[in-house]
């Protein structure tokens, strides 16, 4: 149930936005799939986790991710909203103590083991541009979204609001 305005309008605000409370306002477990219904899976290899985008076999169980939602305040001079200019930020954890991180230098999405408080690289601004689809924008790099590239998750720069409907940054959440 998640749309987006021109990215540029709010990009500066992301750097300055503060998460209003250290505990999430809600959490749920969901499986993550691409717009084209490929599953996001996580595999332990050589003591580190790898993230894959793949077609699952018919009865293969989907991996679940814990999504934790945090309220984050736009600076009032950016949004003009005062108290009501709230964004939702999420962290994504497929297994205990591991969170998805944005590696902006490598343009990659990685799983890192870390303790709370989580670093900014683990927070993503939630958008939805289509019914039932969500997108994840890096808190640390506004205008850059988690996307699919060559059957892996990668960071993808979205340079204008016209490109925000590009299918490779759209994801579906489901309970099954």
């Amino acid at each position: 149930a998640f749309g987006i305005s021109g990215v540029q309008k709010y990009t500066r605000a992301l750097h300055d936005s503060s998460i209003t409370g250290i505990s999430p306002i809600t959490e749920y477990l969901a499986s993550l799939s691409t717009y084209n219904d490929q599953s996001i899976t996580f595999a332990l290899e050589d003591e580190s986790y790898e993230i894959y985008v793949e077609d699952l076999k018919k009865d293969e169980k989907k991996d679940k991710v814990l999504l934790s939602y945090y309220e984050s305040q736009h600076p009032s001079n950016e949004s003009g909203d005062g108290v009501d200019g709230k964004m939702l930020m999420v962290t994504l954890s497929p297994t205990k103590d591991f969170w998805l991180h944005a590696n902006n230098k490598e343009h990659s999405v990685e799983l890192h083991k870390c303790e709370k408080p989580l670093p900014d690289q683990a927070f993503f601004v939630l958008h939805n541009m289509h019914s039932n689809c969500v997108s994840f924008e890096c808190k640390t790099d506004p205008g850059v979204f988690i996307g699919v590239k060559d059957n892996h998750l990668a960071l993808i720069k979205v340079d204008s609001s016209e490109n925000l409907c590009t299918e490779n940054i759209l994801f579906k959440l489901s309970e099954t």
Epitope: A1, F2, G3, I4, S5, G6, K9, Y10, I25, T26, Y28, A30, Y69, E71, H74, S79, G80, D81, G82, D84, G85, K86, M87, L88, V125, L126, H127, N128, M129, H130, S131, N132, S161, L164, C165, L173, S174, E175, T176
Partner: antibody
């Protein structure tokens, strides 16, 4: 102050058209999902449709074809164009705004509503 | 088409009573459900979002629970100002829906 004010309601004959406006103040309308909701006299709330910040629009199944949602960012105003109106479209029409930017979410800000009466 | 089924359609209760209203989604909406209170001649007012999060300024006697397809709004001790109509809404799917709102529950004085 964050506020929504609807206008444009009134009496219209069956088969006629009407355009409702919803003027937003205190926030940028284009950053939020904006929704139209209606309520027939003595009935429940009925979701009409939504315009996303990226201009995607979704309508209730019954509203497709007759109702059109649009917005003018320069005027910070939301619109609902209603065509081929019927007696059963008689209702108070509300515009509403989601609680969060970018995300379709709960409706935290509502207008006062504008009454549309379809009658000959 | 996607639907929200709310029950009961009306309930008679006294001040101090515990009132429970339920809402069922025709398919899973995770926890994307909100609850509204509406009084005659007024616009709806947000009470609960994300199924259980209390909206700003809403008294703690209101609470919400549920996930997936089944959701509940509870008023722990009904106050005179709580006599109103309550609606659930799914905030998940905007595609192919008849109505995002439930049919409403009128809470009346016994």
């Amino acid at each position: 102050e964050v506020q929504l004010v609807e206008s444009g309601g009134g009496l219209v004959q069956p088969g006629g058209s009407l355009r409702l406006s919803c003027a937003a103040s205190g926030f940028s309308l284009s950053s939020y999902h904006m929704i139209w909701v209606r309520q027939a006299p003595g009935k429940g709330l009925e979701w009409v449709g939504v315009i996303y910040p990226n201009s995607n629009i979704y309508y209730a199944t019954w509203a497709k074809g007759r109702f059109t949602i649009s917005r003018d960012n320069s005027k910070n105003t939301l619109y609902l164009q209603m065509n081929s109106l019927r007696a059963e479209d008689t209702a108070v029409y509300y515009c509403a705004r989601t609680i969060y930017v970018h995300v379709y979410s709960a409706l935290s800000i509502w207008g006062q509503g504008t009454l549309v009466t379809v009658s000959s | 088409a996607f639907q929200m089924t709310q029950s009961p359609s009306s309930v008679s209760a006294s001040v101090g009573d515990r009132v429970t209203i339920t809402c069922q989604a025709s398919e899973s909406v995770l926890n994307e459900v909100s609850w509204y209170q509406q009084k005659p001649g007024k616009a709806p007012k947000l009470l609960i979002y994300f199924a259980s999060k209390l909206a700003s300024g809403v008294p703690s006697r209101f609470s919400g629970s549920g996930s997936g397809t089944d959701f509940t709004l509870t008023i722990s001790s009904l106050q005179p100002e709580d006599f109103a109509t309550y609606y659930c809404q799914q905030d998940w799917s905007m595609d192919n829906i008849d109505n995002a709102f439930g049919g409403g529950t009128k809470v009346e004085i016994k």
